[in-house]
């Protein structure tokens, strides 16, 4: 190798200056004794190189690029060699930003997978390889005193969420949780969450069912629906409140919300609906009165209200 480039920093803030030096060794005898060193950033020749012969006979060219506005580019030093440019050395330059503070960190406890799933917003693009690590520790109190550290959780590339498995969790005990973002230009940390995994539990919704008509029970009135639900068994011992939503299947009506309903109601007569109309219904629940997250809405149940029985007056009106 006849030439070698060294740079002040291969990774800089976008828009910052960068200084590079290219040295040509004296023993490159086939070269012009006074070669002119040229600089190129990407495909563009860069003027402004200051060249000098050093005491040991080597040639050095130094260039300062006042603003590196490319997020990635190759800087090369070269010599004219006949009619072509002979590249002596090149380096990759990267420019970007230090990571912003990750924000909107939130977690939920999934009892089915037995894991605490945390997600966050990484902030603006840094243009540099940036790693995110979900860090946590166990705490007896309100996270002011740190207990055992929990193994770092590293999301898959490009993902802004990570799952802490059950073996690293202690239910009914607080955990300090935060996200650390790191790249070549710096490190940032999100504000710390302090939570008991059970306080962010997200339950599965109950299954809505049609109530089986029993011989002794009165049929539903016009504009009413009788429905029941089967709670999600693994969450049965967790006190919950639930809410129903319903809308006519036809038309553009928005959802109407009914609740709160206790999970234990298990069956419900919904009235005040349009007679002889098909409705879509869904239910969801949340741990209550203790903290938790709403479950997803259940799969839809489709039911039809009964027709209004014609009265004498009603019949008369049509004649």
């Amino acid at each position: 190798e006849c030439g070698h480039i060294s740079v002040s920093a291969p990774i800089v803030h976008l828009g910052d200056p960068i200084t590079a030096s290219c040295i040509i060794k004296q023993n490159c005898s086939h070269l012009d004794p006074e070669p002119q060193i040229l600089w190129r950033l990407g495909a563009e020749l860069q003027p402004g190189g200051r060249q000098q012969r050093l005491s040991d006979g080597t040639q050095e060219s130094i260039i300062t690029l006042p603003h590196l506005n490319h997020t990635q580019a190759f800087l090369s030093c070269a010599l004219n060699w006949g009619n072509s440019l002979q590249i002596l050395d090149q380096v990759e330059l990267r420019a970007g930003y230090p990571p912003a503070i990750p924000h909107n960190l939130s977690c939920l406890m999934n009892l089915t997978t037995s894991s605490l799933i945390c997600q966050w917003e990484p902030g603006p693009e840094t243009h540099l390889p940036t790693s995110f690590t979900l860090k946590s520790f166990k705490s007896r109190g309100n996270c002011q005193t740190q207990g055992d550290s929990i193994l770092d959780c590293v999301p898959k590339d490009g993902q802004s969420h990570c799952s802490i498995p059950r073996k690293h969790l202690l239910l009914y005990q607080n955990m300090g949780i935060w996200v650390q973002a790191e790249n070549a230009l710096g490190t940032s940390m999100s504000p710390q969450l302090c939570l008991d995994p059970m306080d962010v539990v997200k339950l599965e919704p109950p299954m809505l069912r049609t109530m089986d008509p029993s011989p002794e029970a009165a049929p539903p009135q016009a504009g009413c629906l009788q429905l029941s639900w089967e709670p999600w068994q693994p969450g049965l011992h967790i006190n919950q409140k639930c809410e129903l939503r319903h809308k006519p299947q036809r038309g553009e009506a928005s959802w109407a919300l009914v609740g709160p309903l206790p999970l234990e109601a298990l069956q419900y007569e919904l009235c005040g609906l349009l007679p002889a109309t098909a409705y879509t219904l869904q239910i969801r629940c949340i741990r209550w009165p203790l903290p938790g997250h709403w479950s997803d809405w259940s799969p839809s149940l489709e039911l039809r209200t009964t027709e209004r029985a014609p009265t004498h007056h009603h019949h008369h009106h049509h004649h």
Partner: antibody, heavy 118, light 107 residues
Framework: EVQLLESGGGLVQPGGSLRLSCAAS????????MGWVRQAPGKGLEWVSS????????PYADSVKGRFTISRDNSKNTLYLQMNSLRAEDTAVYYC???????????WGQGTLVTVSS | DIQMTQSPSSLSASVGDRVTITCRAS??????LNWYQQKPGKAPKLLIY???NLQNGVPSRFSGSGSGTDFTLTISSLQPEDFATYYC?????????FGGGTKVEIK
Amino acid sequence: EVQLLESGGGLVQPGGSLRLSCAASGFTFSLYWMGWVRQAPGKGLEWVSSISSSGGVTPYADSVKGRFTISRDNSKNTLYLQMNSLRAEDTAVYYCAKLGELGWFDPWGQGTLVTVSS
Amino acid sequence: DIQMTQSPSSLSASVGDRVTITCRASQGISSYLNWYQQKPGKAPKLLIYYASNLQNGVPSRFSGSGSGTDFTLTISSLQPEDFATYYCQQSFMYPLYFGGGTKVEIK
């Protein structure tokens, strides 16, 4: 301190009835599921029945379904087990216990012995 | 119904030994597995809930692991007060079932 105190056990003839009570203290009784677990002499633990916090859900073991009724009085912080049509195989120590949110039993009462014999 | 099979039904061990008890569910129960200790003439005592969470006041030599169908209770260094009968219990769905028990005796 959470305490559970069973009472009502004793000797009863086959076909007879007995009502067990469990007085609870030291926690908000109305917020928790409660349950009964029994243990026949020299045998393992057998779940009998549970009751939801407001009493609306009452699952039973097949072995007692239709004969035993679990109930609670949240105003008195008391759990009950009404046992009818008792059989010799119902002879056991009956424990009342508070259920945790994920279905564990803790704590347990000291137990009351029910003996069904003629 | 989800049945629980515990093994061994009994074992003999010495103070300081590492003891492992296993519990198998007849179908997957996620992490809904609890462990209890019972001494003669006493009520059972909760050791571990939700497969691996140590109940308050229980010594750290007790640990639980596993998920799905296979679970383990481990006593890292058996102490004189640990000689007792141990039960597992599934709480994934009703009816609730206990394992048959494992009696840990002095060798």
